[in-house]
Amino acid sequence: KSPIFGPQEVSSIEGDSVSITCYYPDTSVNRHTRKYWCRQGASGMCTTLISSNGYLSKEYSGRANLINFPENNTFVINIEQLTQDDTGSYKCGLGTSNRGLSFDVSLEVSQVPELPSDTHVYTKDIGRNVTIECPFKRENAPSKKSLCKKTNQSCELVIDSTEKVNPSYIGRAKLFMKGTDLTVFYVNISHLTHNDAGLYICQAGEGPSADKKNVDLQVLAPEPELLYKDLRSSVTFECDLGREVANEAKYLCRMNKETCDVIINTLGKRDPDFEGRILITPKDDNGRFSVLITGLRKEDAGHYQCGAHSSGLPQEGWPIQTWQLFVNEESTIPNRRSVVKGVTGGSVAIACPYNPKESSSLKYWCRWEGDGNGHCPVLVGTQAQVQEEYEGRLALFDQPGNGTYTVILNQLTTEDAGFYWCLTNGDSRWRTTIELQVAEATREPNLEVTPQNATAVLGETFTVSCHYPCKFYSQEKYWCKWSNKGCHILPSHDEGARQSSVSCDQSSQLVSMTLNPVSKEDEGWYWCGVKQGQTYGETTAIYIAVEERTRGSSHVNPTDANARAKVALEEEVVDSSISEKENKAIPNPGPFANEREIQNVGDQAQENRASGDAGSADGQSRSSSSK
């Protein structure tokens, strides 16, 4: 399927001009390659009429141009002084020959309709209203006023001043006069439909002295706005229907042969195909609203219409706005898993794509809620603190420059299942939807922290250990301290990276974190996690409470005493070296810095990781080490 897109049908009248916009995928090659407009002949040949290389055919000389807009990935063909000879089939396309990527456009140029010379033309959109002005001489002031619509043989009454109204205009037509002006009457017709188009005559008086005026009412279907979007990206339908329908229910529907199937409306209706990826946002008192759809699929392409009516359904004679949506399958948005699976008590790390050209944009993660018009409250963001009910279990890790940020959610429950959106405050096309599925856990978690009831004593040394399985042996282990602004990685000293090791003892794989001495600020949530480069994996969380020493009490949990003692012994030597290092000022390279310097000490590689929030006060050590 060609990724070029434009208007399928263009119509105009003789003497007028048209402007045809064609869209192409956002690539450097496409921006610079030849653009053309050609006319299809009976033989199937397409004869170039104009191209971006400067070619202009004889029949277009002085009346057409082609302009490339590389910043929008569009080119525009402008043609003036149209004649009926311009009616035909055309292609707009890209490439060195006219057999390149293209889109078919049908152009129809019709004759200017012949109307009586004194005809007043009113041009209105479907669903709107028209007020026809009917002047008359003063002597016809007492006479009957009327408006009729011309049919083949006669003129059928619409409304008159004796309050006679044609059944098809009841509730829609009003005849009135303004103020004291006795030389003009007006007829207002509301909720215009295609059937209302035609010639009308307004009349005051009877016989040869009557005042008559010819009126031509043209009722137009709105020209569809073209929307060119990438697969997996998002689209916003901005609908502006006017103040007169501000209080009516709003809808967005998709054309399906003769009908328009409602996708979403403000009365709570929503097409199941759009579950988790659509929102309708009533904007204001002016009848404006918008519909956001994320995670575009190729089957989403088509003709869309928005409107307003108390039923929340399309209704003839009510204002509408239309779009033609094209979904380009040559997408710049990476193909990521749209479903992420987790288990209760476990964690998920969700990689969110963003436009790499906008690495400084603010990143957000929200949870889609389908009730009412739909909402997506932001749970966390680069500068948006974690929502309170997610305390200790949600963080956003921004990896500047690589087009991805990661959201980690742990301590999962079945309540967390649902749809989530990744988005930024920049390019809105890069909104993506993730469905999170949470199943009941059937086995022990991969990461386990001991002691599980962690209470540290002020001023003492406190160690917690995180046990991990052999499958995580080669991955980087880390501890981080959670706050509502992120999870700040602590400096780590990895004892486990022995070059010669070929076996893995399942029972002794652990990464420990030591607080020495414990201070009141150490209280809070800590995460133990694994990552491979910039790809985050599983995490587990623990809350460490800090309390003052009570006389005669031990802060070591008896059930964990042996394990704790063992860990403490194994870590003792490492800790003394850490304390020395950490008493020196550690530069603060930012919240997620990950600078590593490897020092070989015997057969042991000791890895240091300095990180923001890692610097500690004199005499204090905050570290994690792994075996």
């Epitope: 904007k283 957000y364 929200c366 909402h375 997506c376 603190q385 405050n425």
Partner: nanobody
Framework: EVQLVESGGGLVQAGGSLRLSCAAS????????MGWFRQAPGKEREFVAA????????DYADSVKGRFTISRDNAKNTVYLQMDSLKPEDTAVYYC????????????????????????WGQGTQVTVSS
Amino acid sequence: EVQLVESGGGLVQAGGSLRLSCAASGRTFDSYAMGWFRQAPGKEREFVAAISWTGGSTDYADSVKGRFTISRDNAKNTVYLQMDSLKPEDTAVYYCAAEVVGRDVTTMYRVSGLEYEYDYWGQGTQVTVSS
């Protein structure tokens, strides 16, 4: 409840620049759309500029377009108004205002120039532009 405190006003010559700041108290700063309004002596309070809760959308009064820039730093709970090419007619008390919109995708681009839509107001800071 949010408290708003404006600063940065003062006396400046025509053609000069000033940067106003509005510091907000409270943890939920990023659930407010913010705006700047001004009131010249003997005149009604008028809209100057507004910014959505994400900072992704802004709006300006025609009289200041191209000269004033509104921005925000959610990490610092602060909204700014950079005023360049100042004119004597910019002389007024400048007020910072906050509209509760909630941190939601549906309000990401919401900005308002209507005084009645704002829920909280600062005390104002005087800007005087001399010719």
